[in-house]
């Protein structure tokens, strides 16, 4: 038997994956356990083996489809069940009904690309990815720029309000390189959660002309 | 600019069948939720259900769902509500409208349904 | 079935003044209420989703805000369009439900 807390959160990316985080204070080192997935009106169901990722939690996506099909609807209510191998017997750890479209968590940005850089100023674009069409153009991004001899924590967070796929970047430094990072938001779900910050896109502003006043 | 274009007013008898159209423009129709809503006087508004046409699914309010059909024509981006078994307090003014599933973004100008015999 | 309840059913309001509408829901449903304004002979037009987010191309005032279960539109300088009827929908539960509408009409 397992004492102790157990947290158990899953989100779902929009289309046709439930990422799942279980965590549980005791020790469960050499157990193998796995969240089952159970819709209440869908003819299928899915499993995903929890693997560690420190000492006391596990994760696991459940895949449930081609990454761009729209498996889930906001009428669909899953139950995800913990389960964990106990002798024969399998030993339900954590339960949870998950209403898919009010646990939100999409896709990090994706395709970042500088579409023009000058000496102050960069425009940068970007796509968003698995996102269902259900959502239309009610999403938000948030944007950050790494300055030099900066952290990301200390980036200035810039939010854009809309379904907008770019920015303008504006009082840059001339011949100074900056990284760029986006995450997106659906304004969907009381639990949705903010993407993963996408990857890093690198650039350089443009030098100042020589012997022109900039 | 999106747009919603239904058909005309239709007086029918009780126990009849009647099918509504609704011809969309300036949106991607394939990947897009068409819903229907009932209107009747001095009854407010009430959903009947979508049809989701990328998925291909529908879903209907259990208060309609045993005599509502929702389909749609991807070929000709129109949508069709079809109310079977039609009774006096089915008349109504009709919209079917476009959004996610959550709320109606742009809404038809309506058809008028009476039911009389 | 949520039942939406929006009071008072009909508002009297002068031009320039500021109008307040109430809809209350039979539980809790979070965020998931959504505005429309409905003019006579005309289709209802979307306003104001998750209580509080305009849509754009409505004018800034109008405004919504959330205490619980209770829901409410503001409309801070009524002007002479702004005379019609306006519908709760919440979309926490299936299936969808609207209020029965708030008439405002002119003081």
């Known amino acids: 038997a397992v004492n102790g807390t157990s947290q158990f959160t899953c989100f779902y990316n929009s289309r046709a994956n439930i990422s799942c985080v279980w965590s549980q204070d005791g020790a469960l080192q050499d157990t193998s356990c796995q969240v089952h997935a159970w819709p209440d009106r869908r003819r299928w169901n899915q499993t995903c083996e929890l693997l560690p990722v420190s000492q006391a939690s596990w994760a696991c996506n459940l895949i449930l489809g081609a990454p761009d099909s729209q498996k889930l609807t906001t009428v669909d209510i899953v139950t995800l069940r913990v389960l964990c191998r106990e002798g024969v017997r399998w030993r339900v750890m954590a339960i949870q009904d998950f209403k898919p479209f009010e646990n939100l968590r999409l896709m990090a940005p994706i395709s970042l690309q500088v579409v023009h850089v000058e000496t102050h100023r960069c425009n940068i674009s970007w796509e968003i990815s698995q996102a269902s069409h259900y959502f239309e153009r009610h999403l938000e991004f948030e944007a950050r720029t790494l300055s030099p001899g900066h952290t990301w924590e200390e980036a200035p967070l810039l939010t854009l309000k809309q379904k907008q796929e770019w920015i303008c970047l504006e009082t840059l430094t001339p011949d100074t390189q900056y990284e760029f990072q986006v995450r997106v938001k659906p304004l969907q779900g009381e639990f949705t959660t903010w993407s993963p910050w996408s990857q890093p896109l690198a650039f350089r502003t443009k030098p100042a002309a020589l012997g022109k006043d900039t | 600019e999106v747009q919603l274009v239904q058909s005309g007013a239709e007086v029918k008898k009780p126990g009849a069948t009647v099918k509504i159209s609704c011809k969309v423009s300036?949106?991607?129709?394939?990947?897009?939720?068409i819903h229907w809503v009932q209107q009747a006087p001095g009854k407010g508004l009430e959903w009947m259900g979508w049809?989701?046409?990328?998925?291909?699914?529908?879903e209907y309010a259990p208060g309609f769902q045993d005599r509502v059909t929702i389909t749609a024509d991807t070929s000709t981006d129109t949508a069709y509500m079809e109310l079977s078994s039609l009774r006096s307090e089915d008349t109504a003014v009709y919209y079917c409208?476009?959004?996610?599933?959550?709320?109606?973004?742009?809404w038809g100008q309506g058809t008028t349904v009476t039911v009389s015999s | 079935e949520i039942v939406m309840t929006q009071s008072p059913a009909t508002l009297s309001v002068s031009p320039g003044e500021r109008a307040t509408l109430s809809c209350r829901a039979s539980?809790?449903?979070?965020?998931?209420l959504h505005w429309y304004q409905q003019k006579p002979g005309q289709a209802p037009r979307l306003l104001i989703i998750?209580?509080?987010q305009s849509i754009s191309g409505i004018p800034a005032r109008f405004s919504g805000s959330r205490s619980g279960t209770e829901f409410t539109l503001t409309i801070s300088s009524l002007q002479s369009e702004d005379f019609a009827v306006y519908f709760c929908?919440?979309?926490?539960?299936?299936?969808?439900?609207f209020g029965q509408g708030t008439k405002l009409e002119i003081k």
């Open positions: 539980q809790i449903i979070s965020n998931n």
């Open positions: 929908q919440q979309s926490n539960n299936f299936p969808y439900t």
């Open positions: 049809i989701d046409n990328e998925a291909g699914e529908t």
């Open positions: 998750y209580g509080l």
């Open positions: 409208a476009r959004g996610g599933p959550w709320f109606l973004s742009y």
């Open positions: 300036g949106f991607n129709f394939k990947e897009s939720l």
